[in-house]
């Protein structure tokens, strides 16, 4: 699987999950989240050659098409597969609230 | 929705479904499919700016990150959303077989 265990410990050139730290204020302009100040969101990057963790029959077809037509702009793209939530603290007035923001952290990628 | 109805009738620059005809022999090297000789597979293409048909909370975060960090390689990608099957005819010996190949045709796209 193209997950953090494999990708973070390898020098994989193809589609894989990469490390990305996002600071809520600096990178998003969000001031409403009190904690954490930022988080390891990660992101997906890398080419999707034929047979590389292809998502659907269509992805396989498109990767093969791309192999036969190298100059084509039609190619599968490396995108998130497994996403995890992020717990945050924000304030309503003076009262702190804890909430889980769903689908915030990329754990693995796929070619779609 | 970024579907064929909208995308094929507009000059949309952002993520949208685009027309793509795939010839099984020429483009994939497949000789085993008897009919059809090819099909309109379509593909997804175009940038994914903030708020443009974003798939998950993560996609929104990443698009916003990209807006604040324009040079970054981390950005959402335009990928298939709705896929449809394709009926095909192939031969087992001299006997024709009809089968549905699932997830073969892109009907709409999303930013993931």
């Amino acid at each position: 699987a193209l997950d953090t265990n494999y990708c973070f410990s390898s020098t994989e050139k193809n589609c894989c999950v990469r490390q990305l730290y996002i600071d809520f204020r600096k990178d998003l302009g969000w001031k409403w989240i009190h904690e954490p100040k930022g988080y390891h969101a990660n992101f997906c990057l890398g080419p999707c050659p034929y047979i590389w963790s292809l998502d659907t029959q269509y992805s396989k077809v498109l990767a093969l098409y791309n192999q036969h037509n190298p100059g084509a702009s039609a190619a599968p793209c490396c995108v998130p597969q497994a996403l995890e939530p992020l717990p945050i603290v924000y304030y309503v007035g003076r009262k702190p609230k804890v909430e889980q923001l769903s689908n915030m952290i990329v754990r693995s990628c796929k070619c779609s | 929705a970024l579907d064929t109805n909208y995308c094929f009738s507009s000059t949309e620059k952002n993520c949208c479904v685009r027309q793509l005809y795939i010839d099984f022999r020429k483009d994939l090297g497949w000789k085993w499919i008897h009919e059809p000789k090819g099909y309109h597979a379509n593909f997804c293409l175009g940038p994914c700016p903030y708020i443009w048909s974003l798939d998950t909370q993560y996609s929104k975060v990443l698009a916003l990150y990209n807006q604040h960090n324009p040079g970054a390689s981390a950005a959402p990608c335009c990928v298939p959303q709705a896929l449809e099957p394709l009926p095909i005819v192939y031969y087992v010996g001299r006997k024709p077989k009809v089968e549905q190949l699932s997830n073969m045709i892109v009907r709409s796209c999303k930013c993931s």
Epitope: R25, K26, K31, E35, K37, P87, V89 | -
Partner: antibody, heavy 117, light 102 residues
Framework: QVLLVQSGAEVRKPGASVKIFCKAS????????MNWLRQAPEQGLEWMGQ????????NYNGKFKGRLTLTADTSTNTAYMELSSLRSADTAMYYC??????????WGQGALVTVSS | DIVMTQTPLSLPVTPGEPASISCRAS??????LAWYLQKPGQSPRLLIY???NLADGVPSRFSGSGSGTDFTLRISSVEADDVGVYYC?????????FGQGT
Amino acid sequence: QVLLVQSGAEVRKPGASVKIFCKASGYSFTSSWMNWLRQAPEQGLEWMGQIYPGDGDTNYNGKFKGRLTLTADTSTNTAYMELSSLRSADTAMYYCARHYDGSTDYWGQGALVTVSS
Amino acid sequence: DIVMTQTPLSLPVTPGEPASISCRASENIYSNLAWYLQKPGQSPRLLIYAATNLADGVPSRFSGSGSGTDFTLRISSVEADDVGVYYCQHFWGTPYTFGQGT
């Protein structure tokens, strides 16, 4: 490399105020929270407050509310901590420390403040 | 305020032996915890952030584990240079309180 250089030792009488500085270099000063902490002699660490130099937003430990003021000068990449109405219990080593990724990753060398009559 | 409780308060260790320090939070802090080492006369030094991540330049004999309310700092093989006071600190809403130190 990241460097936080603090002002020297200060001696104050009870009731007075003290203002110490922390000059930052080697990173984007405006886009990282700066924490202030202290450590009384032979005691543990205590978090006092933090400031976001980019917009001046602050979070204070309620224990110091009304006595503690955090400011930042983005033209010189310098953070300031002012503590008023000093008492002998405020005698401590005062630290500035950069906030990063759920931690304070770089610390100043500390500034000793002694409150004595 | 969240209360951080460290155990033990004192830990004598022979060089080459493993050591572990526990830190308990009075409420769920998820993985928002850091560990520091303070040597005599020095500023604290970050060892572990986000409960399990080794800070830059920290030897691999140090490791952190846990999430929620219970956390552990482990030293696989203690060296003489590891002497000092170890602190845990939470980052789950201000004020960011520390353990008493070990």
